[in-house]
């Protein structure tokens, strides 16, 4: 996704994005909370595709690993947290049933706040 | 994705998530920046699946439409901004070529900062 820094902006939380193949992902959690195996190849009409996923997570090496950037620290505690979304993937469940299921993948790094008590 | 409010937390930016069908989406932008038509149905081994996408964007009705929550306003201007990610979808390009392409979809609402000048 577009880089805020190019517009002279900073993100409240630093993130890293990468392309991940099913060969590296291996397993995932589906919408019902079950662990499924992510298949390497997707049969398409006239061939096979590698399953790829575009994943974004909080940067563990970033400035914001100790808390979010730009927060009013007098009133708030903050934390950068990886959030997930759902994408459809060809998977196999624990009963060896192959099918298209929505799995959770990391898609963003957002800032969450808790109010400071007892100031 | 998990709701921070359940843990007594607030998001710096308010977001809304929804399931969107290809019938509603109609078109999208692919990785090369071209506009493609998103096909309603995907042929699978035993029939057809409706193409669905899980999309998250900034809540236009939310508290944070004027700026991000919890920001140190003495030093920063802030804005909640919808970010995008890539998912694979069955699409048709302008030359009527049908194929699996990575398209951009809304996946998050994050806060971006610009430093306040001339205080």
């Amino acid at each position: 996704h577009s880089d805020p820094a190019r517009r002279g902006e900073l993100s409240v939380c630093d993130s890293i994005s990468e392309w991940v193949t099913a060969a590296d992902k291996k397993t995932a959690v589906d919408m019902s909370g079950g662990t499924v195996t992510v298949l390497e190849k997707v049969p398409v009409s006239k061939g096979q595709l590698k399953q790829y996923f575009y994943e974004t997570k909080c940067n563990p090496m970033g400035y914001t690993k100790e808390g979010c950037r730009g927060i009013d620290k007098r009133h708030w505690n903050s934390q950068c947290r990886t959030t997930q979304s759902y994408v459809r993937a060809l998977t196999m469940d624990s009963k060896k049933r192959i099918g298209w299921r929505f799995i959770r993948i990391d898609t963003s790094c957002v800032c969450t706040l808790t109010i400071k008590r007892g100031r | 994705h998990s709701d921070p409010a359940r843990r007594g937390e607030l998001s710096v930016c308010d977001s809304i998530s929804e399931w969107v069908t290809a019938a509603d989406k109609k078109t999208a932008v692919d990785m090369s920046g071209g506009t493609v038509t998103v096909l309603e149905k995907v042929p699978v081994s035993k029939g057809q699946l409706k193409q669905y996408f899980y999309e998250t964007k900034c809540n236009p009705m939310g508290y944070t439409k004027e700026g991000c929550r919890g920001i140190d306003k003495r030093h920063w201007n802030s804005q909640c901004r919808t970010t995008q990610s890539y998912v694979r979808a069955l699409t048709m390009d302008s030359k009527k070529r049908i194929g699996w392409r990575f398209i951009r979809i809304d996946t998050s609402c994050v806060c971006t900062l610009t430093i306040k000048r001339g205080r």
């Epitope: 990468e18 392309w19 991940v20 193949t21 099913a22 060969a23 590296d24 992902k25 291996k26 390497e40 398409v44 009409s45 006239k46 061939g47 096979q48 595709l49 590698k50 790829y52 | 990785m31 030359k95 070529r97 194929g99 392409r101 990575f102």
Partner: antibody
């Protein structure tokens, strides 16, 4: 600019071993599956081996299975090919090639390193 | 394993003319075909992917098309730098990824 630089080639006797390296720069190395393709003198191109971005998946041509081992060190942005039990028919220029995310074709190639197997 | 057969083995053309190169697959591969150019002493360079999509920076005189299992690379108005060997590659069924034997385009 994307750059792939192979090294480690040389003249060896049948039955001996060699380790080829490919130093990558100018792109996010772990985002891409990588491959080795070889070309015997005056001949066409032959795909040899491939590896997924994080190394979880490895793939080999039948002609090299059991003798060749592909690996990568993402911290060093380097791809490797360990070649054992060399045969005369392994004599070739070995190219390191970056796989596109859009499909299993090669969008960038190194200049190659020559392996000569001769008694 | 999918076999790709390229023809002709050598194509002799005058600069400015059109060159038509053929690649036939032994079975259906959809549009999962790429074309590469290789000059003597150099690495191959990607020209076309998905049978008809031009790679970044490739001049529009290069075009690809498909008809069933027959694929064509057309070079309109051959420039001096276009004289080289051209290879097709399938990525429909893998592994293995397979290449055609190549077509050499030489100056008439």
């Amino acid at each position: 600019d994307v750059q792939l630089v192979e090294s480690g080639g040389g003249v060896v006797r049948p039955g001996e071993s060699l380790r080829l390296s490919c130093a990558a720069s100018g792109f996010t190395f772990n985002n891409h599956d990588m491959n080795w393709v070889r070309q015997a003198p005056g001949e066409g191109l032959e795909w040899v081996s491939g590896i997924s971005g994080r190394g979880g998946g490895t793939y080999y041509a039948d002609s090299v299975k059991g003798r060749f081992t592909i690996s990568r060190d993402n911290s060093k942005n380097t791809l490797y090919l360990q070649i054992n039990s060399l045969r005369a028919e392994d004599t070739a220029i070995y190219y390191c090639a970056r796989e596109s995310i859009w499909g299993i074709f090669f969008d960038y190639w190194g200049l190659g390193t020559l392996v000569t197997v001769s008694s | 394993e999918i076999v790709l057969t390229q023809s002709p083995g050598t194509l002799t053309v005058s600069p400015g003319d059109r060159a038509t190169l053929s690649c036939r697959a032994s079975q259906t591969i959809g549009s999962y075909l790429a074309w590469y150019q290789q000059k003597p002493g150099q690495a191959p360079r990607l020209l076309i992917y998905d049978a008809s999509s031009r790679a970044t920076g490739i001049p529009d005189r290069f075009s690809g098309s498909e008809s069933g299992t027959d694929f064509t690379l057309t070079i309109n108005g051959l420039a001096p730098e276009d004289f080289a060997v051209y290879y097709c590659q399938q990525y429909s069924n893998w592994p293995p990824l397979t290449f055609g034997g190549g077509t050499k385009v030489e100056i008439k």
